[in-house]
């Protein structure tokens, strides 16, 4: 893959247009170091400025001042003000205002179920798979097999609970090492930011809403991935982190408490309850080598049964089976011992959609993803559409400035702590750092949030989620109580670590940028965003999977060059924007590399060939097939034979920069497509009125 | 009521081979294992070796293994003894004993075969 | 294999008395041990199982105690019928082992 979406020369003056992962765009000198590349051949750049290739430009009035991307969106209010109504048509504003909260809590109601039910899909596709990662003896010496372990299986059940409690459990038993289970639990919380990745995918529609939403959402991965990055060997060279939270748990004499609070499931449960339920036990018991659960089916049918304890006498192979000398016996021909034995007798059957189908898991599972993602994306474009048209105006303007506003001058760096604060509360709340984030997501998205901001309110989502992890320790039975609890301290110590990392300093806020020129380039190749989410959550865990049960020499040979490549590439695009003087000639730019290494552009012909079978195909029937459809043709005209569609290429004609001769309009690079800014396709028409 | 009947007395010369029957009654026959424990004169018991007559598993102890052999009839709900290789050490009472279900003790003994050898 | 040793090899006692057998195993045989009664010319009678388990019949006087390695058989007041040579056998590991015998006489 390329060392940079767009690697070409090092150019010394910043203010001219170029082709940048957003496109072209005037940038200021901070930000050059960033999007200053293009696919230019090698020329002496520092002897005369030259204008960019398409000179056509200058035909473009332009701007004084060109639009940052990153600028939250001004919504304009186009209806008719509070003071000028009559009466009736005040009762009717107020009583539309209600109706749209009711519409607007109701699908943010569903956009919950739907992720939860998105969770038991993903368990019920890859949840035994996932249980299989676990009963891999190789975690126990190998953390880099831990954290990859860690971040496939919560991908897999879409839940960091899940992969966590399974963690606690195998400790408990003595399968599992704290020091193991450490790299496993670093895994689990770069999986779990998969949720709201997922999410932003769903507003590929427009370009610059996607670009915000997917930063939005990436923060939360390039945060973790970081933190990993830097925390994994510090933590194998080190063992803090173990060595802290041992202390934590040894001087204080903890008592069992109540359960962690479970307040939104109490609104979520009796819904998502009648389309499935699922026995997570099942995942736990294949990841401690039960043999038995591996035929088992994760869909829950009885929910009412009785269970009676008896001991029976049991065959053994030999004595050397035996749980204990004292409960094996011979009959001079066999090995006895004795079992407890629950017998377990089925009174009442779940009610739920799938309980009578008796479906093998992966069909109920597929059903449900299917099901629960186009839930979620209606609900999504619903909730965009209605906040949309709720904060317009005045409104929009008092929630930006409160949301994004800081505080007076001596205590403005407090703002963020704040935030943190406000959204480790929020997820304590929702009980799921994934909901929060999730919904987070839409709001970064349509601008009343900024990525600024958003980023602390990842970061607290992330402390918020391990907070109810130790109350949830706290609360579990005595055997198990010290090593949930020390688990749930290793993750509360680990987001604490990452945060002091990456946020005290604003130097140091990396995943901001990171997260930025991944929306900058998700917005001008939206298939790179799916790309990106297979390659890092899907790829990479699954290829040093593979290494490392190859053992650990063929890992070392194969990570060390890789890791050695990386560094090298990092260092000298540092050095070109930097100081390329320093550099020979040759390298002072990306150039000598053949274009598929350097730029997305010829990947993208080869993806818009691959996908072009389908644009002629695709027949949607409403704005979600569309934007679904539109992320994988990349084209604003791929639903055809779409009302909705047809709407949006209509829509588009007067969203074009102003020109001086219309019959330029031929030539692509005047369109403020090519600038990188907002595409032709992107216009908000409204297909259906609220 | 449970009974195991032996059949009766042998006298053998060294290196012969002796087969002593075990005939049981009053209950299932391939429900117990039936153990055969000797004892020589004057002396304490000896566990030799188990059948289980419903599959014909049988164990044997370490020290016979080789030259004991047990087998079962379940038509005739018999159980059989034969030691081979016989020595003048082998004299002894033959007792075949009923095991308790899933246990190692006997609950109903036979009344004994004397096996006599002597050259 | 389970060595298993009985003391006293010999007991006088006269009826009436409390008598005390002990047995003691090489190894940890948990409760898997078993108590019999064997008079002159006759089979073996099983008194006790699972080490303090009384069998069908036996009377009450006849009771067994112990785990792991030590055991007891304990005939709270010996009665004529009683003078006999008691056993202890293990069932814990294969093969089977017997005591050497304790043989309780009359005084």
């Known amino acids: 893959m390329a060392p940079w979406p767009e690697l070409g020369d090092a150019q010394p003056n910043p203010d001219k247009y170029l082709e940048g992962a957003a496109g072209q765009q005037p940038t200021a000198p901070d930000k050059s170091k960033e999007t200053n590349k293009t696919d230019n051949t090698e020329a002496p750049v520092t002897k005369i400025e030259l204008l960019p290739s398409y000179s056509t430009a200058t035909l473009i009035d332009e701007p004084t001042e060109v639009d940052d991307p990153w600028n939250l969106p001004t919504l304009q209010d186009s209806g008719i003000k509070w003071s000028e109504r009559d009466t009736k048509g005040k009762i009717l504003c107020f009583f539309q205002g209600i109706g749209r909260l009711i519409l607007l809590l109701g699908f943010l109601y569903f956009f919950v179920c739907s992720l939860d039910i998105l969770s038991s899909a993903f368990q019920l596709v890859g949840g035994k798979m996932a249980g299989q990662f676990f009963s891999n003896s190789s975690i126990m010496s190998n953390p880099l097999l831990g954290l990859v372990i860690g971040v496939l299986v919560t991908v897999l059940v879409q839940s960091s609970s899940t992969s966590t409690s399974i963690v606690v459990s195998m400790v408990s038993s003595s399968l599992l090492t704290v020091r193991a289970a450490i790299p496993i639990i670093m895994g689990a919380n770069i999986g779990t930011s998969i949720t709201n990745t997922i999410v932003a995918l769903m507003q590929v529609g427009d370009r610059s809403e996607f670009r915000r939403a997917f930063a939005g959402a990436t923060v939360h991965d390039f945060f973790n991935w970081l933190s990993v990055l830097v925390l994994l060997p510090v933590e194998v060279a080190t063992h803090y982190l173990e060595i802290i939270t041992q202390l934590i748990v040894e001087s204080f004499h903890f008592k069992n408490g109540e359960d962690a609070p479970d307040l939104l499931k109490v609104i979520t449960k009796p819904f998502t309850k009648l389309i499935v339920q699922l026995d997570k036990k099942v995942i736990s018991q294949i990841a401690m080598n039960d043999e038995k659960a591996k035929n088992k089916s994760l869909v829950k049918i009885w929910c009412k049964t009785f269970t009676n304890k008896t001991q029976i006498n049991v065959t053994v192979p030999s004595t050397a089976n035996c749980t204990s000398p004292s409960l094996c016996w011979t009959d001079g021909i066999q090995n006895w011992t004795m079992k407890n034995v629950t017998y377990k007798e089925n009174i009442a059957k779940c009610q739920h959609i799938f309980v009578n189908f008796h479906l093998p898991d992966l069909a109920v599972g597929t059903i449900l993803l299917i099901l629960s993602l186009l839930v979620l994306c209606g609900c999504l474009i619903m909730i965009v559409k209605i906040l949309g048209s709720v904060l317009k105006g005045q409104v929009a303007t008092v929630i930006k400035k409160t949301i994004n506003t800081d505080f007076p001058f001596p205590f403005a760096w407090l703002t963020g702590y704040l935030a943190i604060l406000v959204g480790a509360g929020m997820t304590f709340i929702v009980q799921s750092s994934s909901v929060f984030t999730s919904a987070l997501t839409p709001l970064i998205g349509i601008g009343v949030i900024t990525i600024e901001r958003a980023y602390p309110l990842t970061l607290g989502s992330n402390i918020g989620t391990t907070t109810t992890a130790i109350l949830a320790a706290l609360a579990s039975p005595g055997n198990a109580l010290r090593s949930s609890l020390q688990i749930a301290l290793c993750h509360f110590f680990f987001n604490i670590s990452g945060i002091l990392l990456w946020y005290p300093i604003p130097f140091t806020r990396l995943p901001i940028r990171m997260a930025k020129g991944l929306g900058n380039i998700s917005a001008k190749y939206r298939w790179f965003a799916v790309f990106y989410l297979i390659i890092f959550f899907f790829l990479i865990p699954l290829t040093v999977f593979g290494l490392s049960l190859a053992g650990w020499r063929v890992l070392v040979g194969v990570g060390v060059p890789v890791v050695f490549i990386i560094i090298l590439v990092l260092c000298l695009r540092l050095l070109q924007s930097r100081c390329p003087r320093v550099l020979p000639k040759k390298l002072q730019n990306w150039n000598f590399l053949p274009l598929w290494m350097r730029s997305l552009k010829p990947w993208d012909a080869v993806v818009s060939k691959f996908t072009g079978c389908f644009q002629m195909r695709c027949c949607c029937c409403c704005r979600v097939c569309c934007r679904a459809c539109c992320l994988l043709c990349d084209c604003p005209k791929c639903c055809r034979c779409s009302k909705c569609c047809e709407d949006l290429e209509e829509a588009q004609e007067g969203q074009d920069v102003p020109v001086k001769a219309p019959e330029t309009f031929d030539n692509i690079t005047i369109s403020r497509e090519a600038q990188g800014e907002v595409p032709a396709s992107d216009s908000k028409t409204e297909c259906t009125a609220l | 009521q449970v009974q195991l009947v032996e059949s009766g007395a042998e006298v053998k010369q060294p290196g012969e081979s002796v087969k002593v029957s075990c005939k049981a009654s009053?209950?299932?026959?391939?429900?117990?294992?039936l153990h055969w424990v000797r004892q020589a004169p004057g002396q304490g018991l000896e566990w030799m070796g188990a059948?289980?007559?419903?599959?014909?598993?049988?164990s044997y102890s370490q020290k016979f293994q080789g030259r004991v052999t047990l087998t079962v009839d379940k038509s005739a709900s018999t159980a059989y003894m034969e030691l081979s290789s016989l020595r003048s050490e082998d004299t002894a009472v033959y007792f075949c004993?009923?095991?308790?279900?899933?246990?190692?003790?006997?609950?109903?003994w036979g009344q004994g075969t004397l096996v006599t050898v002597s050259s | 294999d389970i060595q298993m040793t009985q003391s006293p090899s010999f007991l006088s006692a006269s009826v009436g008395d409390r008598v005390t057998i002990t047995c003691s195993a090489s190894?940890?045989?948990?409760?898997?041990v078993t108590w019999y009664q064997q008079k002159p010319g006759q089979s073996p009678k099983l008194l006790i199982y699972?080490?303090?388990s009384r069998y069908t019949g036996v009377p009450s006087r006849f009771s067994g105690s112990g785990s792991g390695t030590d055991f007891t058989l304990t005939i709270s007041s010996l009665q004529p019928e009683d003078f006999a040579t008691y056993y202890c056998?293990?069932?814990?590991?294969?093969?089977?082992?017997f005591g050497q015998g304790t043989k309780v006489e009359i005084k």
């Open positions: 004993a009923r095991g308790l279900p899933y246990l190692g003790a006997m609950d109903y």
């Open positions: 009053g209950y299932t026959f391939t429900s117990n294992n």
């Open positions: 059948v289980y007559p419903g599959s014909g598993d049988t």
């Open positions: 190894q940890n045989v948990g409760i898997f």
């Open positions: 699972s080490a303090s």
């Open positions: 056998q293990q069932y814990s590991r294969s093969p089977l082992s």
